[in-house]
């Protein structure tokens, strides 16, 4: 499987909510001996590989925000901790995987990464990630609502797998 990022850039006004999205592509094993781990984190555009560094999102680590389930099951993050920070990550039956950030501030600007790991009994992890940029703007140049910019087909397939 691969991960696609439908949008590579989100430009939002301060105070707005945004939902960043990744999508699983390709066949997904739903066997009893396979589990999917999905999470979000902030990162930096490394010279060699984007999404290597894992920084917290609003003080929540990638482990705080992870989802853990089989196949295309739906899942949500544990509500208390994430929602106290204005965050919620979710996964649906169709391979869509998102994080919603409420009441954006300028400090939320940066590179965001989704990570999906297939964990299978006796096998090495299969890891894929996607990256997208969030720009939070203020003042007269800021849009009234979030504006999203689609990834080029090349970018949306440009995924790193171990």
């Amino acid at each position: 499987f691969k991960v696609a990022t439908p949008y590579s850039l989100y430009v939002c006004p301060e105070g707005q909510n945004v939902t960043l999205t990744c999508r699983l592509l390709g066949p997904v094993d739903k066997g009893h001996d396979v589990t999917f781990y999905k999470t979000w984190y902030r990162s930096s555009r490394g010279e060699v590989q984007t999404c290597s560094e894992r920084r917290p999102i609003r003080n929540l680590t990638f482990q705080d925000l992870h989802l853990h389930h089989g196949g295309h099951q739906a899942a949500n993050t544990s509500h208390d901790l994430a929602q106290r920070h204005g965050l919620e990550s979710a996964s649906d039956h169709h391979g869509n995987f998102s994080i919603t950030m409420r009441n954006l501030t300028l400090l939320d600007s940066g590179l965001y990464c989704c990570l999906v790991v297939e964990i299978r009994h006796h096998h090495s992890e299969h890891r894929v990630h996607g990256a997208m940029e969030l720009q939070v703007q203020t003042g007269k140049d800021a849009p009234s609502n979030c504006v999203v910019y689609p990834s080029s087909s090349q970018d949306s397939e440009n995924i790193t797998a171990a």
Epitope: D33, G46, V48, Q49, S52, E53, H66, I119, H122, E125
Partner: antibody, heavy 119, light 107 residues
Framework: QLQLQESGPGLVKPSETLSLTCTVS??????????WGWIRQPPGKGLEWIGS???????YYNPSLKSRVTISVDTSKNQSSLKLNSVTTADTAVYYC???????????WGQGTLVTVSS | DIQMTQSPSSLSASVGDRVTITCRAS??????LAWYQQKPEKAPKSLIY???SLQSGVPSRFSGSGSGTDFTLTISSLQPEDFATYYC?????????FGQGTKLEIK
């Protein structure tokens, strides 16, 4: 803060089974998204990964030890255990338990326990 | 199995020196490489993950670089507490493997 503490006999006879326990405090061993691993280090030598157990119960072993090793967890005691059977003197080492998140390296380690295999 | 080869095996240096340790993987491991520091009678401590990302709480004089098969750990200005043994580890695939270690000694 997470703490890992290995315990078990410091001396095991050749051909017997080495049994060690790793007690976790400051966190739950059943937390999803983590592996609980064992690494060993013979005196004066380097590190060797023995195996890891994922929170779902999946196990991963070093092929060089796979026929002799079993890693399990007891969630009620918040413990991981290592069993290595048919030991020889080559199994003399400091044994560490360690935790690693999904798609990450070992970020938390116990202080290690020396096990000597000798008759 | 992926073999990890470190060089040099031992190294003498002085406080304030810049030191570089290299690690080579027998096959490509992307950026799935970690560096650890181990002092005598102590457990290893994680310094670097994902080849170049600093573990929380680790001083910024430590840095890592590389991708694929060739990696380096650099200490920009050696401090007295940095004299120890350093190990690289690949976590690209099972079985996870470590380099044989580099012992950093005081000159």
């Amino acid at each position: 803060q997470l703490q890992l503490q290995e315990s078990g006999p410091g001396l095991v006879k050749p051909s017997e089974t080495l049994s060690l326990t790793c007690t976790v405090s400051g966190g739950s061993i059943s937390s999803s998204g983590y592996y609980w691993g064992w690494i060993r280090q013979p005196p004066g030598k380097g590190l060797e990964w023995i195996g890891s157990l994922y929170s779902s119960g999946y196990t991963y072993y070093n092929p060089s030890l796979k026929s002799r090793v079993t890693i399990s967890v007891d969630t009620s005691k918040n413990q991981s255990s290592l069993k290595l059977n048919s030991v020889t003197t080559a199994d003399t080492a400091v044994y560490y338990c360690a935790r690693h998140p999904v798609a990450m390296n070992f970020d938390d380690w116990g202080q290690g326990t020396l096990v000597t295999v000798s008759s | 199995d992926i073999q990890m080869t470190q060089s040099p095996s031992s190294l003498s240096a002085s406080v304030g020196d810049r030191v570089t340790i290299t690690c080579r993987a027998s096959q490509g491991i992307s950026s799935w490489l970690a560096w650890y520091q181990q002092k005598p009678e102590k457990a290893p401590k994680s310094l670097i993950y994902a080849a170049s990302s600093l573990q929380s709480g680790v001083p910024s004089r430590f840095s890592g670089s590389g991708s694929g098969t060739d990696f380096t750990l650099t200490i920009s200005s050696l401090q007295p507490e940095d004299f120890a043994t350093y190990y690289c580890q690949q976590y690209n695939s099972y079985p996870y493997t470590f380099g044989q270690g580099t012992k950093l000694e005081i000159k």
